[in-house]
């Protein structure tokens, strides 16, 4: 299927110009290769009219021009003084030859219809009102005022001063005086509809005397705006249908064959097909709401209409906007998965993407929820805090320049299942939709932290692990200190060249983290996860509340009683003989216990087990404080 | 960041007027949609109105509807909140919000200004 998308009809009169929009996928090549605009002969065959490359044929000449917006991948084929000749079928395309990424654009011309000469025109949209105008003389101010509508032979009755009403008309039709000015009435018709275009008379007085006067009213449908979007991107309908209408149900409709089909409306009604991916936004002080679809499917594309109607549904009669939306599939949005699932207890990396060439845009993320017109709370983003109900388990990461921001979501319950929204303050065609399915767990954590009840004594070393599983031997590790604003990722150090191990006993990885020595501020969330470069993985999370200590425990002076609290992260392979209290069991904060840093030994455990005590508790300890000797000399 | 000041605050009688300003800089200003909200003394911070980024579309409170008027000017960063008919109940400090957002997803403000105070005697 051809990326290029334009106008399928285009409808002028003699004498009158046409501007024809065309659009090509943003991709380089297309921005600066040949456009052009030929007419389709009987063979088959394209005959150029005009090109970017500067040819203008003879029936072209001075009435007619290609420009290439860059900028907006668009170019426009403008041309003047339309003739009858010029109907016919036409291809506005991209390549070197007429045989390239082409669409096609039929241009029909018709004839100026001949009116009588003294006709006023009246041009409105179908739902609108009209007002005729209708002049007379002072002595026809106390005859009957009528307006007729002219059918073949004769002139039936819309309505007049004596309150008769053709019934198709009765109330949308109203006669009326202004004021004091008897040389003037008035007809008002409303909720127009393509029934009531055609040639009018409107007539003051009776016989030869009577005034008259000839109205032509053209009732047009709306011309579609065209809107072209890139798969998995996403579109906004802004619908903008006056005041008169602002207090009425709205909705949004895609035309299938000769119904249009409600997506959604302002009464609750939605389509199932755009569940999780569509919201109607609240109405403007004028009456004006706009419907957002995100995730946008190659079956999104099609026409559709915005409206406004007490029934929520589309009525004739009633103003309407419409779209012809085309869905690009050679789209710039990178493929990712639609669906993530994770497991009760569990946590879940998203990976967001944003247009990369906004990477200083303010990055969000938003659950959609159906109720009513459907809304997206945000959740978390750059500047926003996160929501209260997510405190501890939610934070946005933002990687500079990636194209990419990742969301981690942990502590899952199945609450958390449903749609959420990937959003920035930039470029609105990259807004994306994720499914998150919560199964429940079937078997124990990859990550768990010990001790899972956490409670830290002020002034004292507190140490907490995290234990993984081999899979994660490779990835980097790391404990971050969770706050509304985000994880902040502590510092780690890696000794020396990481180690590989030969054998992975599946019980024995973990990863420490020391608060030493502890202070009130390290109270809070702490997480713990894995990452590859900037590809994050699985976390999990731990509350650790700071206490005073009570009387008679035993604490470890710090050598700085204003260093802030000690933080070190060890990474050991643990002998499986030793338990994990008699692993912890003698807090050894070293020589440098006041350094504010995490210390990432990496797998250089597995030679110190192999040299050290590892039979006894005491053992490890030395061997894990003679690594930080080593490391700062 | 976004630095937002607001001025134009003061005291005014009941049925008086005032026009309230508010002056961004840092990043571009077109990128935000714009909102006033007041905070009376012991109650929450409400929303009066709001504005798109392109300033097409306006947002009020129903307390503030035909009274107030919001309105932008991106050329030069500011933001206006034209108040009519003040009535003693509109006493609050009134603050102005940057939002990344427009209104699609619910106006919550990603940077706020000082506030500046109004007070409407009877």
């Known amino acids: 299927k051809s990326p290029i998308f334009g106008p399928q009809e285009v409808s002028s009169i003699e004498g009158d110009s046409v501007s024809i929009t065309c659009y090509y996928p943003d991709t380089s090549v297309n921005r600066h290769t040949r456009k052009y605009w030929c007419r389709q002969g009987a063979s088959g065959m394209c005959t150029t009219l005009i090109s970017s490359n500067g040819y203008l044929s003879k029936e072209y000449s001075g009435r007619a021009n290609l420009i290439n917006f860059p900028e907006n991948n668009t170019f426009v084929i403008n041309i003047e003084q339309l003739t009858q000749d010029d109907t016919g079928s036409y291809k506005c395309g991209l390549g070197t030859s007429n045989r390239g990424l082409s669409f096609d654009v039929s241009l029909e011309v018709s004839q100026v219809p001949e009116l009588p000469s003294d006709t006023h025109v009246y041009t409105k949209d179908i739902g609108r009102n009209v007002t005729i105008e209708c002049p007379f003389k002072r002595e026809n101010a106390p005859s009957k005022k009528s307006l007729c509508k002219k059918t073949n032979q004769s002139c039936e009755l819309v309505i007049d001063s004596t309150e008769k009403v053709n019934p198709s008309y009765i109330g949308r039709a109203k006669l009326f005086m202004k004021g004091t000015d008897l040389t003037v009435f008035y007809v008002n018709i409303s909720h127009l509809t393509h029934n009531d275009a055609g040639l009018y008379i409107c007539q003051a007085g009776e016989g030869p005397s009577a005034d008259k006067k000839n109205v032509d009213l053209q009732v047009l449908a709306p011309e579609p705006e065209l809107l072209y979007k890139d798969l998995r991107s996403s579109v906004t309908f802004e619908c903008d249908l006056g005041r008169e209408v602002a207090n009425e149900a709205k909705y949004l409709c895609r035309m299938n064959k000769e119904t249009c089909d409600v997506i959604i409306n302002t009464l609750g009604k939605r389509d199932p097909d755009f569940e999780g991916r569509i919201l109607i936004t609240p109405k403007d002080d004028n009456g004006r709401f706009s419907v957002l679809i995100t995730g946008l499917r190659k079956e999104d594309a099609g026409h559709y209409q915005c409206g406004a109607h007490s029934s929520g549904l589309p009525q004739e009669g009633w103003p309407i906007q419409t779209w012809q939306l085309f869905v690009n599939e050679e789209s710039t949005i990178p493929n990712r998965r639609s669906v993530v699932k994770g497991v009760t207890g569990g946590s879940v990396a998203i990976a967001c993407p944003y247009n990369p060439k906004e990477s200083s845009s303010l990055k969000y993320w938003c659950r959609w929820e159906g109720d009513g017109n459907g809304h997206c709370p945000v959740l978390v983003g750059t500047q926003a805090q996160v929501q209260e109900e997510y405190e501890g388990r939610l934070a946005l990461f933002d990687q500079p320049g990636n194209g990419t921001y990742t969301v981690i979501l942990n502590q899952l319950t199945t609450e958390d299942a449903g749609f959420y929204w990937c959003l920035t303050n930039g470029d609105s065609r990259w807004r994306t939709t994720i499914e998150l399915q919560v199964a429940e767990a079937t078997r124990e954590p990859n990550l768990e932290v010990t001790p899972q009840n956490a409670t830290a004594v002020l002034g004292e070393t507190f140490t907490v692990s995290c234990h993984y599983p081999c899979k994660f031997y490779s990835q980097e590790k790391y404990w971050c200190k969770w706050s509304n604003k985000g994880c902040h990722i502590l510092p780690s150090h890696d000794e020396g060249a990481r180690q590989s191990s030969v054998s992975c006993d599946q019980s024995s990885q973990l990863v420490s983290m020391t608060l030493n020595p502890v202070s009130k501020e390290d109270e809070g969330w702490y997480w713990c996860g894995v990452k590859q470069g900037q590809t994050y993985g699985e976390t999990t999370a731990i509350y650790i509340a700071v206490e005073e200590r009570t009387r008679g425990s035993s604490h470890v002076n710090p050598t700085d009683a204003n260093a802030r609290a000690k933080v070190a992260l060890e990474e050991e392979v643990v002998d499986s003989s030793i338990s994990e209290k008699e692993n912890k069991a003698i807090p050894n904060p070293g020589p440098f216990a006041n350094e504010r840093e995490i210390q990432n030994v990496g797998d250089q455990a597995q030679e110190n087990r192999a040299s050290g005590d590892a039979g006894s508790a005491d053992g490890q300890s030395r061997s894990s404080s003679s690594k930080h000797h080593h490391h700062h000399h | 960041e976004v630095q937002l000041v607001e001025s134009g605050g003061g005291s005014v009688q009941a049925g008086g007027s005032l026009r309230l300003s508010c002056a961004a800089s840092?990043?571009?200003?077109?990128?935000?949609?714009m909102g006033w909200f007041r905070q009376a003394p012991g109650k929450e911070r409400e929303f009066v109105a709001g504005i798109s980024r392109s300033g097409g579309s306006t947002y009020s409170a129903d307390s503030v509807k035909g009274r107030f008027t919001i309105s932008r000017d991106n050329a030069k960063n500011t933001v206006y909140l034209q108040m009519n008919s003040l009535k003693p109940e509109d006493t609050a400090v009134y603050y102005c919000?940057?939002?990344?957002?427009?209104?699609?997803?619910?106006?919550?403000?990603?940077?706020w200004g000082q506030g500046t105070q109004v007070t409407v005697s009877s």
């Open positions: 919000a940057a939002d990344g957002l427009d209104y699609a997803l619910g106006f919550r403000g990603d940077y």
């Open positions: 840092g990043r571009t200003f077109s990128n935000y949609a």
